[in-house]
Interface confidence: medium
């Protein structure tokens, strides 16, 4: 007779949906990589549930995740970064559900930072610049960035610009005069690695000059 047969909690657990999703961050802390997983159903009772990754690891067969509130997390140098790993939700030694995942296809870059906008009066444009930690990385170096901006009063009217560099020029005539704008940027892997959009950078706010009535241009 199975030892699990008398465990009512486990029998109930097997009826639950243990779907989960994960993302990896490479060289997120020096040469350390991270892997973060979470259940798709926020109401899953995570008591006694553990995550384990096996395969495509360096020097070890498997690694256990640490639990941080409702997310499960590993920080390690031991990801092989080629081939698929098996990630399982476990209760004790019993696997409830598993997924084969190539960690290079679920990369979530770090958010860009130091976003700023400088108005060039002579050129009648705004130069948007930002920084990314990925310029210094060995692995996820090539990113596509999504710059989004909106007039502050237009809550959901974001204009998006995709670019591979960390510099963008916005023409003054494309923006409303004497208006407050919010701008932010995020990144996604673009080349060998695949995955998800990073978190948005902190927003930057800038005001466009007023129109100079005599010339029809902004001040």
């Amino acid at each position: 007779e199975s030892g699990y047969a008398q465990n009512g909690d486990l029998e109930d657990a097997e009826l639950d949906d243990y779907s989960f999703s994960c993302y990896s961050q490479l060289e997120v802390n020096g040469s350390q990589h991270s892997l973060t997983c979470a259940f798709e159903d926020p109401d899953v009772n995570t008591t006694n549930l553990e995550f384990e990754i096996c395969g495509a690891l360096v020097e070890v067969k498997c690694l256990n995740f640490r639990k941080l509130q409702e997310i499960y997390f590993i920080e390690t140098k031991k990801f092989l970064l080629i081939g698929k790993s098996n990630i399982c939700v476990k209760v004790g030694e019993k696997s409830l559900t598993c997924k084969k995942i190539d960690l290079t296809t679920i990369v979530k870059p770090e958010a860009p930072f130091d976003l700023s906008v400088i108005y060039r009066e002579g050129a009648n444009d705004f130069v948007v610049t930002f920084n990314t930690s990925h310029l210094q990385k060995k692995y996820v170096k090539v990113l596509m960035h999504d710059v989004a901006y909106r007039q502050e009063k237009d809550e959901n009217k974001w204009t998006h610009v995709n670019l591979s560099s960390t510099k963008l020029t916005l023409l003054q005539r494309k923006l409303q005069p004497a208006a407050m704008y919010e701008i932010k940027v995020r990144s996604i892997p673009d080349h060998y690695f695949k995955g998800f959009w990073s978190e948005w950078s902190p927003s930057y706010y800038f005001r466009t000059p007023e129109i100079n009535n005599s010339s029809g241009e902004m001040d």
Partner: antibody, heavy 121, light 109 residues
């Protein structure tokens, strides 16, 4: 039974092309990176090329870079090596090999019996 | 690229002998090393991975040790079927490449 069967070898003149094939069976082909390794007569093993499960990771030995192309068709459980601008020094027995990264390191745990390529005028 | 140098290139030994083959990497590779055995006319066979883990079905007289730059393959008591050529192998995952040592030929004395 896990099996790799190479084909496509033969006698070819220098400068010509040849395409090797490797038919895989007995395992989930698209879970594994695959490699070509060659062995010239009386010589040691030389890694030629490798390709990740999804074809996004590809590598070549310096001796074949720019001349050989590795590719795979996961739907057909097949691995290929397109060899162009062949030279006499490419003469060798060419093995197809499966990786087994789940062991913790990239190791070649299953090998075919090889197909012979002879480059000679 | 990392170079692997095996020594000796060849050696003669008798049945029952203890034999050690070494593999030196040109730079540290942690324990990213495998050993293969190849008999004439046959494909190579995996013996050891992770520098010291024995492949399933391989006799326990084979063992591997080492990390960093220096690795050894030891056969504790040679059997007639062990006379073959042995190769060490290392890999890199990004960019993808594999390197083999030049081989060590083990012959009957």
């Amino acid at each position: 039974e896990v099996q790799l069967v190479e084909s496509g070898g033969g006698l070819v003149q220098p400068g010509r092309s040849l395409r090797l094939s490797c038919a895989a069976s007995g395992f989930t082909f698209d879970d594994h990176a695959m490699h070509w390794v060659r062995q010239a007569p009386g010589k040691g093993l030389e890694w030629v090329s490798g390709i990740s499960w999804n074809s996004r990771g590809i590598g070549y030995a310096d001796s074949v870079k720019g001349r050989f192309t590795i590719f795979r068709d996961n739907a057909k459980n097949s691995l290929y090596l397109q060899m162009n601008s062949l030279r006499a020094e490419d003469t060798a027995l060419y093995y197809c090999a499966k990786d087994e990264y789940s062991r913790g390191y990239y190791v070649l745990d299953v090998w075919g019996q090889g197909t012979t390529v002879t480059v000679s005028s | 690229a990392i170079q692997l140098t095996q020594s000796p290139s060849s050696l003669s030994a008798s049945v029952g002998d203890r034999v050690t083959i070494t593999c030196r990497a040109s730079q540290g590779i942690s324990s990213a090393l495998a050993w293969y055995q190849q008999k004439p006319g046959k494909a190579p066979k995996l013996l050891i991975y992770d520098a010291s883990s024995l492949e399933s079905g391989v006799p326990s007289r084979f063992s591997g040790s080492g990390s960093g730059t220096d690795f050894t393959l030891t056969i504790s008591s040679l059997q007639p079927e062990d006379f073959a050529t042995y190769y060490c192998q290392q890999f890199n995952s990004y960019p993808l490449w594999i390197a083999f040592g030049q081989g060590t030929r083990l012959e009957i004395k």
